[in-house]
């Protein structure tokens, strides 16, 4: 076992001479992004104050390619890198095409309305007039491709003009536009060369040791890894922590059960019920508030102040009133919970599916005519699964090196 341990320690480090270095640099696991949209069936009725009715459409599947660049080894046992992602639509794996039309809340209009709720009426009237003249409505009918990667909207220029620096978009607005062909920030992580216990743990993100999106030091902490590999020699007491730039926070997953993936022993880690719980149910999450119902996290502070919320799909594990407020939601543990299957000896993921939902809080705002009589509701926009499983040559090599050889050596 000590020989095996030595081999593992030698080969999991972030070091050009280690076996896993190329795997770390260019992840050989094929990743897929599956997106499910909530098509709004009754937009006119919602504007009259009726309960929203949605229909899940999808999946729209994209192959996700990741590569690390600007890899710089620092002299404090850390390495800095940028990871770029590109997405390629996979028609054969998808249920529909990127030219499918989806009726969705107009995030720019309804988001701006909620943001302006406490502003003076005169400003709201100017905004209403702007929306009217620019032909903006509370709901929009856009293609999957436009919603994902961006559509031209005169409102984008308007927001940039009147609220300079607030908005990360130029000319076009798309929910995944920021992710495609771009990096997720500069990560600086420990290499494990000098101290294996800190391997993969994030030292800094974009030069920061902590973020300032939230209202408590604990919630602002950058904990865990960058979400791709973890320190080796895990036990069922281990937790899986990582910093997610998309969620603007660290997340902690807990051990659920042992399993086997393609002959390789794994630990399955899942989200605790408290992941998106509000502060009254789980006090450590108070820093993420102000909160609405439990089970959704307000990400407005890191999403250009728009009233956007992150949760499990279909409001799984959330306060039941959220799913009950929208017709067409059916939370299901099997279909909607996230998991990561990790090889505990190396800390390398074998099979994973991270599932999250993005929702918009919308309501009627006096003075913003476009909001009609909308009753306050957290309306799901889409949910996605980022999934990957080790396969082919990589799986074979991994199995040989880390399962077969130790067995042979043992006997």
């Amino acid at each position: 076992p000590s020989l095996i341990k030595q081999q593992v320690l030698k080969n999991v480090r972030i070091d050009p001479s280690s076996l896993s270095f190329n795997m770390w640099k260019e992840i050989p696991i094929p990743f897929y992004l599956s997106v499910y949209f909530f098509d709004v069936m009754n937009p006119s009725e919602i504007l009259k104050g009726e309960k929203p009715q949605v229909r899940e459409r999808g999946p729209y599947v994209y192959r996700e390619f990741r590569h690390k660049s600007n890899i710089t080894f620092n002299n404090n046992d850390t390495v800095s890198f940028l990871e770029y992602r590109t997405f390629q639509f996979q028609p054969s794996k998808s249920h529909g095409s990127e030219s499918d039309y989806i009726v969705m809340p107009n995030i720019l209009v309804l988001g701006a309305a909620v943001m302006m709720e406490n502003k003076p009426m005169t400003l709201k009237l100017i905004m209403t007039l702007a929306f009217t003249t620019l032909g903006e409505r509370a709901f929009m009918n856009r293609t999957v491709g436009e919603i994902m990667w961006g559509y031209k909207d005169p409102l984008v220029n308007l927001i940039n003009k009147y609220f300079p620096g607030m908005f990360p978009f130029k000319d076009k607005f798309g929910l995944f536009a920021e992710l495609n062909n771009s990096d997720s920030g500069l990560f600086t992580v420990f290499t494990g060369v000098q101290n294996i216990s800190r391997i993969h743990l994030v030292d800094k993100w974009n030069g920061l040791s902590k973020v300032d999106f939230w209202h408590s030091d604990q919630c602002n902490m950058i904990n865990g890894t960058s979400g791709q590999m973890w320190p080796p020699f895990m036990t069922p007491e281990s937790s899986l922590e990582f910093y997610s730039p998309e969620a603007c926070r660290s997340m902690k997953l807990m051990y659920k059960e042992s399993g086997v993936f393609e002959g390789i022993p794994t630990y399955r880690f899942v989200a605790p019920k408290t992941l998106f719980a509000n502060g009254s149910i789980y006090p450590p999450n108070e820093g993420f508030c102000p909160c609405l119902e439990s089970g959704i996290q307000n990400v407005s502070t890191c999403r250009f102040s728009a009233p956007l919320f992150l949760s499990h799909p279909h409001f799984l594990n959330a306060d039941p009133v959220l799913a009950e407020a929208v017709t067409g939601l059916h939370p299901n543990q099997e279909a909607h919970s996230l998991f990561l299957d990790i090889h505990p000896v190396t800390g390398i993921p074998m099979n994973c599916s991270v599932k999250l939902q993005l929702s918009l809080y919308m309501k009627s705002v006096a003075g913003i005519g476009q909001t009609g009589k909308i009753e306050p509701v957290v309306l799901p926009l889409l949910w996605f699964a980022e999934s990957g499983a080790m396969e082919g040559e990589t799986l074979h090599t991994f199995y040989t090196q880390l399962v077969l050889m130790p067995k042979v050596m043992h006997y």
């Epitope: 005169t122 100017i126 209403t128 007039l129 003249t133 009147y162």
Partner: antibody
Framework: QVQLVQSGAEVKKPGSSVKVSCKAS????????FSWVRQAPGQGLEWMGG????????NYAQKFQGRVTITADESTSTAYMELSSLRSEDTAVYYC???????????????WGQGTLVTVSS | QSALTQPASVSGSPGQSITISCTGT?????????VYWYQQHPGKAPKLMIY???NRPSGVSNRFSGSKSGNTASLTISGLQAEDEADYYC?????????FGGGTKLTVL
């Protein structure tokens, strides 16, 4: 060419009400907002309030709150301003003005009516 | 008393340039770019000359220009002409209100 044509001059007794109309022609009425601004003899301009007809959304200057009512009738492309509890200091020319927005920005009081003189006298 | 302060009068000879100032506070002129200038000839309705600090509506001569520094907005008229003689009012958005200056009488000598 957009034009705003207002109703004729009025003479009113103190304590009574006056209703001034403003008919828009040459544009899509529902695309605009309409404001009311008054000018006492030899004085400057004073904003009273406004409306966006398509949503029937109104907004009033605090000074006139409770005394002024702005309405619109989309079928006739006409905006109205009613001022109640008139006093002598309400003697002024009352203007309606169109508010407009386009991709270049916000045009407050972009086009004005010819004005309606309201005289409050006992 | 007006919320925005303008000089009561300015004058200039034909061909000259003049500037009319409009001083407000950090709550109106200084807070937003919603600053407007209107021209009013005697007995006529006002006419919009500058919108959002420095933009000219179509049909307004490029001799008219607007600017803003801190809490003071300015209207400059270059190449003064006889027909420019009128009252000029500035206006700004302020705390749920539209406020006007007291007006400046421009005399072309």
């Amino acid at each position: 060419q957009v034009q705003l044509v207002q109703s004729g001059a009025e003479v009113k007794k103190p304590g009574s009400s006056v209703k001034v109309s403003c008919k828009a022609s040459g544009g899509t009425f529902s695309d605009y907002g309409f404001s009311w601004v008054r000018q006492a003899p030899g004085q400057g301009l004073e904003w009273m309030g406004g409306i966006i007809p398509i949503f029937d959304t109104t907004n009033y200057a605090q000074k006139f709150q409770g005394r002024v009512t702005i309405t619109a009738d989309e079928s006739t492309s006409t905006a109205y301003m009613e001022l109640s509890s008139l006093r002598s200091e309400d003697t002024a020319v009352y203007y309606c003005a169109r508010d407009f927005f386009d991709s270049a920005g916000y045009y407050a009081f972009e086009i004005w009516g010819q004005g309606t003189l309201v005289t409050v006298s006992s | 008393q007006s919320a925005l302060t303008q000089p009561a009068s300015v004058s200039g000879s034909p061909g000259q340039s003049i500037t009319i100032s409009c001083t407000g506070t950090s709550s109106d002129v200084g807070a937003f770019n919603f600053v407007y200038w209107y021209q009013q000839h005697p007995g006529k309705a006002p006419k919009l000359m500058i919108y959002e600090v420095s933009n000219r509506p179509s049909g307004v001569s490029n001799r008219f220009s607007g600017s803003k520094s801190g809490n003071t907005a300015s209207l400059t008229i270059s190449g003064l002409q006889a027909e420019d003689e009128a009252d000029y009012y500035c206006s700004s958005y302020a705390d749920n209100n539209w406020v006007f200056g007291g007006g400046t009488k421009l005399t072309v000598l």
